[in-house]
Every structure is written in C-alpha cells, then in structure tokens.
Interface confidence: low
C-alpha cells in the first residue's frame, strides 16, 4: 500500500497498547452540508416497502440513540394500495461503528464496536424454491 | 437524564481537552454474530429499485473503505421487468460515524466525523405537484 509520511506534530504514542488505543476528538465534524432533508425524510411512508422507525437507546454507547427500521409488511404495496404478497419487503442493513464505554460507565474511555442496523426497506422479488 | 455512577477503574481524565478527547480501543468488538450476509447480499439485484455499489476509499479515514449505493434507474422495475417511470428509485441515506486522522497522517490521533452514505435504494410513489 501507499506509505504516508508521519506528521511530526502527532501526539506521543508511548502508550504500551499503541496502536490499539488511540486518542479521538469527540467534536464531531459534519461533512453533510449539502444534504436536502426535504427530499428524503418521508421515504419510509411513500415506499412500496414502507417501514417504521424504532428508538434504540443505550447510555453506555456513543451515540446513545439509534433509530432502527422495521418493515411494515411482509409483502409490498401495489398500485392499488394493497399488500402484494408475491413480492417481499426486506430490510436494508448496514454495519456501523459505534463507541462502547469500556470499562463500563467511564466518561472518557471507549472501545470501537461494529453493529448491524436496519436503515430502511426495499421491495424484492422473492426467491421461489420449486419442489420436484 | 439518568446518572450512572462512575467506574473507579476509569482512565485518568486530566487531559486539558477532557471530555472532548477520549481514549478508544480499536480492537473492534463485533456484535453481528448471528447475521447471515448471504441473506441480504443480493437485494441490490433483486430489488424493484436496484442499485450498484461503488467503492469509496480514503486512507485518512477509518474505516478506509466505504461502499456507496447508486440507484440504477430513475424509475422502478415493474412485474414485466421494465422500468416504470410512474414510480421513483431513491437512495436510502444514513449518517454514519467514521474516524478521520487528525492531524493528518497520524497513526494514533483521530477526530469523529459524520458522513452521509447511501446504503441502498427503495421504490417510492412520486410527489406530484398539481399546478392550478
């Protein structure tokens, strides 16, 4: 891979756990300046595979609140507004990074954790297994 | 909010930037032990709003590789396999946490960053503005 020269202004790395333990600045930098919330905020209701959002809260995690999508139907909404069970509503899942307080209840010590969240739902053609 | 008693085994927090700067252990704990990747890996192809996945790589970010979804069509795939432009394929977006090396090129110093990623696509009924 590419070797990037180390910045001489880097913090000291004498910690015996280095490089497993790193310093992280929690002042979040938000790169999402050009997003337009109006365009996407109601997709959960307008989708042919609509979903509800459920609040998952854990004070030992950062961020402490995560919203989880749950598909409303097994099937998908057809042009008449009815549920068509020849199609399936399925959750789109994504692995995300969160910080877990470790040791527990510590305000300034965390461990990276990877969790799977359902972000929304999509309508798919089902896989049909034909039995001979 | 709930006040949780502080663990006496917490690391020292004398850092002048505390609590903005915290220690993070990069040994990732993966909570997704029961997930079956095969179950959702082909949704991008089977969806009525199919998408392609594009690799976004940045060595100054952790994780350095992020996959971005791009909807294949403006419309959605109908029962005949054709694109129906009376419906819209739209990206489902999510804000995620990443770590950005700061100062640049430092192996052990990061800043939390929030970025918006497209995880997949869903099919929605368009908003039609009727002009009087």
């Amino acid at each position: 891979g590419i070797t990037i020269p180390r910045n001489p202004g880097c913090p000291n790395s004498e910690d015996k756990n280095f490089p497993r333990t790193v310093m992280v600045n929690l002042n979040i930098h938000n790169r999402n300046t050009n997003t337009n919330p109006k365009r996407s905020s109601d997709y959960y209701n307008r989708s042919t595979s609509p979903w509800n959002l459920h609040r998952n809260e854990d004070p030992e995690r950062y961020p402490s609140v995560i919203w989880e999508a749950k598909c409303r139907h097994l099937g998908c909404i057809n042009a008449d507004g009815n549920v068509d069970y020849h199609m399936n509503s399925v959750p789109i899942q994504q692995e995300i990074l969160v910080l877990r307080r470790e040791p527990p209840h510590c305000p300034n010590s965390f461990r990276l954790e990877k969790i799977l969240v359902s972000v929304g739902c999509t309508c798919v053609t089902p896989i049909v297994h034909h039995v001979a | 909010g709930i006040t949780i008693p502080r663990n006496p085994g917490c690391p020292n927090s004398e850092d002048k930037n505390f609590p903005r700067t915290v220690m993070v252990n990069l040994n990732i704990h993966n909570r997704n032990t029961n997930t079956n990747p095969k179950r959702s890996s082909d949704y991008y192809n089977r969806s009525t709003s199919p998408w392609n996945l594009h690799r976004n790589e940045d060595p100054e970010r952790y994780p350095s590789v992020i996959w971005e979804a791009k909807c294949r069509h403006l419309g959605c795939i109908n029962a005949d396999g054709n694109v129906d432009y009376h419906m819209n394929s739209v990206p489902i977006q999510q804000e995620i946490l990443v770590l950005r090396r700061e100062p640049p090129h430092c192996p052990n110093s990061f800043r939390l960053e929030k970025i918006l990623v497209s995880v997949g696509c869903t099919c929605v009924t368009p908003i039609v503005h009727h002009v009087a």
């Epitope: 919330p37 905020s41 959002l53 961020p63 609140v65 | 999510q94």
Partner: nanobody, 119 residues
Framework: EVQLVESGGGLVRPGGSLRLSCAAS????????MYWVRQAPGKGLEWVAK????????YYVDSVKGRFTISRDNAKKSLYLQMNSLRAEDTAVYYC????????????WGQGTLVTVSS
C-alpha cells in the same frame, strides 16, 4: 453538545388543546429545519410536522393537517407545536428533532414529552 428539551405534554380530554415547546442549545438553531415527531405506545416513529430554517415553509402529516401548527422563534432558539382538536390517536411521546428524520443514529432528539388524550 446538542441538546433538545421538550415540555408542555400532559393529560387532555378529546377535543382539547396543548402547546408543546422545545428549547434547543449547542448548535446554530436558525440554520436547521426542525421536526416534531411522535411515537405512540408500541408503534413506530411518525413525523408530525416540519418547519424550515427561517419559518418560511411548514409541512404536516395528513392526520394532523388543520389541527396542529408548528412554529419557531429563532431568537429564543425554540420550537413549538400548537395542538388543537386533540384525538385519542394523538396519544404518543412527542420529540423535537434537528434536521433529517431518516434512520439516523445521532442523539439529536430530546427525551420527549408524553401527550395523553383520554376522557
């Protein structure tokens, strides 16, 4: 640190009114669209109303149109929801939220205020 603190909830009879308030801090309030969202017992999240940064545009879910009014006071960094002609189905925890209401996982939500509509 972003903080959103809701107040004004309570028990009210059908047909009654309530005014919810949300006090914001830790961010430039006037730069963001703001939402009221609600979660009824055992149900998913439902967005109720949205107001643009400058208050120029408002959006409502169909079930509250004509009954609820969203407003804001940027000088006071406050968001409001005037709820009239309340119905039993409006019973929920009401949250004010900053920005987008996709399934984000940032805690830019208050702890909520409970509205109970019952005779």
């Amino acid at each position: 640190e972003v903080q959103l603190v809701e107040s004004g909830g309570g028990l009210v009879r059908p047909g009654g009114s309530l005014r919810l308030s949300c006090a914001a801090s830790g961010f430039t309030f006037s730069s963001y669209g703001m939402y009221w969202v609600r979660q009824a017992p055992g149900k998913g999240l439902e967005w109720v109303a949205k107001i643009e940064q400058d208050g120029s545009e408002e959006y409502y879910v169909d079930s509250v149109k004509g009954r609820f009014t969203i407003s804001r006071d940027n000088a006071k960094k406050s968001l409001y929801l005037q709820m009239n002609s309340l119905r039993a189905e409006d019973t929920a925890v009401y949250y004010c939220a900053k920005g987008e209401i996709l399934p984000l996982y940032f805690d830019y939500w208050g702890q909520g205020t409970l509205v109970t509509v019952s005779s």
